[in-house]
Structures are given as structure tokens and as C-alpha cells.
């Protein structure tokens, strides 16, 4: 039962994580204009992996896709690639894990097959989570670098009479969504790997040991030696399938006011 719960929970956590990775990848707010000395702005800029947007205080928002792939910063391209790889691996992992779920009966699938599938999906979730975390971190690092470069430019260019407003960008909501989602996917993957250990088939090996006593010979056959990879020393016989199938509850024109003030 604990194995089924661990596997089921791992699946749900990974599912939420992958949904989060997809959401983060699609979100436009990867970087948002830093309102360092101007908490109320009439023009607010924010950027995603795929397009940049400008929201005017009048409520009108205009988004524009990036024109050239080659002209984009390498870090942005790396973040895109890592997020896509994370989504693809996560999606495959979800597909594999559905069939690996202990509560789902598929023909006469062996426990060993389910254990292998659980392990495979777990590893996929772990890699998927790491890809998402890496993608978000690469982008965040690019932002930090650009932020300090912009700050340096801001203070070196203040000698003239006419001030040019230097737009600095800081972490957007998508980064935090990505980090949390990547972490959840990673945790889900670890849980699947743990569940896999409990799903491995119980081999009962009878090893006969002969004891030669004086006068007569008695052969003792001790109780079955448990070859389970589970954590507990549970010696009860397990059913191949859990009782009933467990069901898990799975838990954006008019202009609009700017929400960045």
C-alpha cells in the first residue's frame, strides 16, 4: 500500500511539476522591467522566451514575437532548448508512468516490468526537472549579468543634460514558476524511483541447509529468504495488484489596468 501511495503521489507531483514547466515556458513574464526608483510606471516592459510585451498604463498590451532566431542571445536559446527538452522528457515520463502505476491493470504485466517502467519514468522526471531548473537558472544568470551591466551604464551616462531612461530587467514570475515546477518534477521523479524499489518482484529462494547431528540427519528448510528490495522487513505475502484502483483528484480586447504598480 505504501508503495502504491508513493508511486501515485510521485505521479501526481510530477504531473503538477510538468504542467508548471509547460506554463512557465509559455509565460511572457520571464523578465520584467525593474521599477527600482519608479514604482508607478506609464509603460511597463516584460519579456518571455518567445516574445516581448509592453503594457501601457492605459491598459493596452502589445506583444511582439522575436524576429530572428540567430540574433537572440545564446542564453535565451539555451533556456528555450532546456525547457523544451524538459517538457518532452516529462511528457514521455508521464506516459510511461501511467502504464507503470500499480493501481492500473494492463493485461498480465509483470511486477518487474512495472518496476522498470516506474524507474524509467522516475529518471525521466528527474532529468526533466533538472532541465527546467537549468533552463530557468541560465536565463536568471543572463538577467543578473545584464542588470549589473545596465546599472553600470546608468551611472556612467549621467553626465549629460538629457537623460536616457535605461530599462533594466529583473526576475519575472515565470522564473519562480519554473524553479518550483522543476523542483516538483524532480521530487516526483525521486518518489517514483523509491516506489520502484518496492515494486520489484519478491523472489522466494529456498536454500536447504543440512545439519548433521549424531545418530540421525535432519534437514532444516528455513522460511523463505526475502529478496525484496523494499525498505521494510515485511515478510507478508503481497498480492500482485492492490485492491481497488486509486483515483487521484487533479487538482487570460478590452484594455486592463496595469498590475505592476
Amino acid at each position: 500500500m505504501a508503495v502504491t501511495a508513493c508511486q501515485g503521489l510521485g505521479f501526481v507531483v510530477s504531473l503538477i511539476g510538468i504542467a508548471g514547466i509547460i506554463a512557465a515556458t509559455c509565460m511572457d513574464q520571464w523578465s520584467t522591467q525593474d521599477l527600482y526608483n519608479n514604482p508607478v510606471t506609464a509603460v511597463f516592459n516584460y519579456q518571455g522566451l518567445w516574445r516581448s510585451c509592453v503594457r501601457e498604463s492605459s491598459g493596452f498590451t502589445e506583444c511582439r514575437g522575436y524576429d530572428s532566431l540567430l540574433a537572440l542571445p545564446q542564453d535565451l536559446q539555451a533556456a528555450r532548448a532546456l525547457m523544451i527538452v524538459g517538457i518532452v522528457l516529462g511528457a514521455i515520463g508521464l506516459l510511461v508512468s501511467i502504464f507503470a502505476l500499480k493501481c492500473i491493470r494492463i493485461g498480465s504485466m509483470e511486477d518487474s516490468a512495472k518496476a522498470n517502467m516506474t524507474l524509467t519514468s522516475g529518471i525521466m522526471f528527474i532529468v526533466s526537472g533538472l532541465c527546467a531548473i537549468a533552463g530557468v537558472s541560465v536565463f536568471a544568470n543572463m538577467l543578473v549579468t545584464n542588470f549589473w551591466m545596465s546599472t553600470a551604464n546608468m551611472y556612467t551616462g549621467m553626465g549629460g543634460m538629457v537623460q536616457t531612461v535605461q530599462t533594466r530587467y529583473t526576475f519575472g514570475a515565470a522564473l519562480f514558476v519554473g524553479w518550483v515546477a522543476g523542483g516538483l518534477t524532480l521530487i516526483g521523479g525521486v518518489m517514483m524511483c523509491i516506489a520502484c524499489r518496492g515494486l520489484a518482484p519478491e523472489e522466494t529462494n529456498y536454500k536447504a541447509v543440512s545439519y548433521h547431528a549424531s545418530g540421525h540427519s535432519v534437514a532444516y528448510k528455513p522460511g523463505g529468504f526475502k529478496a525484496s528490495t523494499g525498505f521494510g522487513s515485511n515478510t507478508k505475502n503481497k498480492k500482485i495488484y492492490d485492491g481497488g484502483a486509486r483515483t487521484e483528484d487533479e487538482v487570460q480586447s478590452y484594455p486592463s489596468k496595469h498590475d505592476y504598480v
Partner: antibody, heavy 118, light 113 residues
């Protein structure tokens, strides 16, 4: 069509607060910012502040922060600007306007001429 | 606050002439996010409220005759009337729409001979 209706004139005694109105029609009132602009006789334009009718969020020009208070009544699609302790300096034409693309003001009321006199 | 400076303060022309008026801002009005200049031009005829002519420095509002053209970027902007008509007699104001508080220029008064 879009209209912003303002009373033509208001007379107020110095020190007695006054509430100017701006009734909007012909569009979804709660979806566009309402701005207030001051114009003294023979002078230029000054932006006082704006209000978002949907949630009454306001921005003020610091110069008018203690002078003007912007409010809205969504049920009657009317925006208000209350001027506290008016003096002769507050005698001017006050326009209400609607925000448009580029943060520009596409529709303007006819303006209320406020006279502060004893 | 961004200071808007308009020049000349007034100009007198004959009908059919080409007119240009200038507007300078103390800070750049160019937004890097969409490469648009947040400058607006208004026309105010005597006894009337201002009327929107041009926003984003060069985008003509619908219904505005095409003889009105806005140009410029950053801190220097120009409003050009290619062939002045008698009905163009008005005061023309430029406005900063880039940062709060929104500020207006002192205006350029156009008079017809």
C-alpha cells in the same frame, strides 16, 4: 458614440470644497482610465491624475496630491474630482479625458469652468 | 518630472504653406521594449477642448487629415502640417506619455495671415 459630459461651470467660495463630475457614455466605463487635466485661462495644460474605474486605482501628479481626490461611481458611469480648500489659483477649466493607446487622451469632455470667488 | 519644451511659441503662416513645430523632452521618450516613442500631439482650437492628433510620436489618430505628420525619436520631435488650412488655426501641444506625471509642452500657437 463615446461621450464625456461635464457641467459647463461651477462657482465655489474659497475654502469650500467642490466636486466636479464627468459622466461617460458610449463605451465600457470600467475598461478605460479617466484622466483629469487643468487649464488656467490663457495657459497650458496640466495633468492632475487618473483613475481606473474598475477598481478605483489612482495615480496623482504630486503637485495635486493634496488638492485633488479622484473617485468613480460605476453604477452611473461617472467620474468625480473633489478639490479641497480651493483658492483663486484653482480657478481654471478642468477637463476629464479617456486614456487610449500610447497613453494618449482620445476623448475629452467639454470642460468645467471652475470659478473660485467670494 | 519630464520637462517638455516647445518652439516656437507662436508662428504666423499663410494658407497652403508648410509648417513645422518642435518639441523637446528632458528625457528620452523612446521605450526600448517596443521601440516606440511615447509622445502625443494635440490640437486645441479656441473655446474647445484639445483634440488628439498623433500618438506614439508618428501614429495618426483616425479621422485626422494626412497633412498632419509627426516625426522624431528620443528627445526631439516635430509636428509638420504639409499645407496649412484656415481651420488649422489652433494651439498645438505635445505631451510626454512615457512616465508619470504626464507633462505637456507650453504650446505653439499657429496663426493664419
Amino acid at each position: 458614440q463615446v461621450q464625456l459630459q461635464q457641467p459647463g461651470a461651477e462657482l465655489v467660495r474659497p475654502g469650500a470644497s467642490v466636486k466636479l463630475s464627468c459622466k461617460a457614455s458610449g463605451y465600457t466605463f470600467t475598461s478605460y482610465w479617466i484622466n483629469w487635466v487643468k487649464q488656467r485661462p490663457g495657459q497650458g495644460l496640466e495633468w492632475i491624475g487618473n483613475i481606473y474605474p474598475s477598481d478605483s486605482y489612482t495615480n496623482y501628479n504630486q503637485k495635486f496630491k493634496d488638492k485633488a481626490t479622484l473617485t468613480v461611481d460605476k453604477s452611473s458611469s461617472t467620474a468625480y474630482m473633489q478639490l479641497s480648500s480651493p483658492t483663486s489659483e484653482d480657478s481654471a477649466v478642468y477637463y476629464c479625458t479617456r486614456s487610449w493607446r500610447g497613453n494618449s487622451f482620445d476623448y475629452w469632455g467639454q470642460g468645467t469652468t471652475l470659478t473660485v470667488s467670494s | 518630472d519630464i520637462v517638455m519644451t516647445q518652439s516656437p511659441s507662436s508662428l504666423t503662416v499663410t494658407a497652403g504653406e508648410k509648417v513645422t513645430m518642435s518639441c523637446k523632452s528632458s528625457q528620452s521618450l523612446l521605450n526600448s521594449g517596443n521601440q516606440k516613442n511615447y509622445l502625443t500631439w494635440y490640437q486645441q482650437k479656441p473655446g474647445q477642448p484639445p483634440k488628439l492628433l498623433i500618438y506614439w510620436a508618428s501614429t495618426r489618430e483616425s479621422g485626422v487629415p494626412d497633412r498632419f505628420t509627426g516625426s522624431g525619436s528620443g528627445t526631439d520631435f516635430t509636428l509638420t502640417i504639409s499645407s496649412v488650412q484656415a481651420e488649422d488655426l489652433a494651439v498645438y501641444y505635445c505631451q510626454n506619455d512615457y512616465s508619470y506625471p504626464f507633462t505637456f509642452g507650453s504650446g505653439t500657437k499657429l496663426e493664419i495671415k
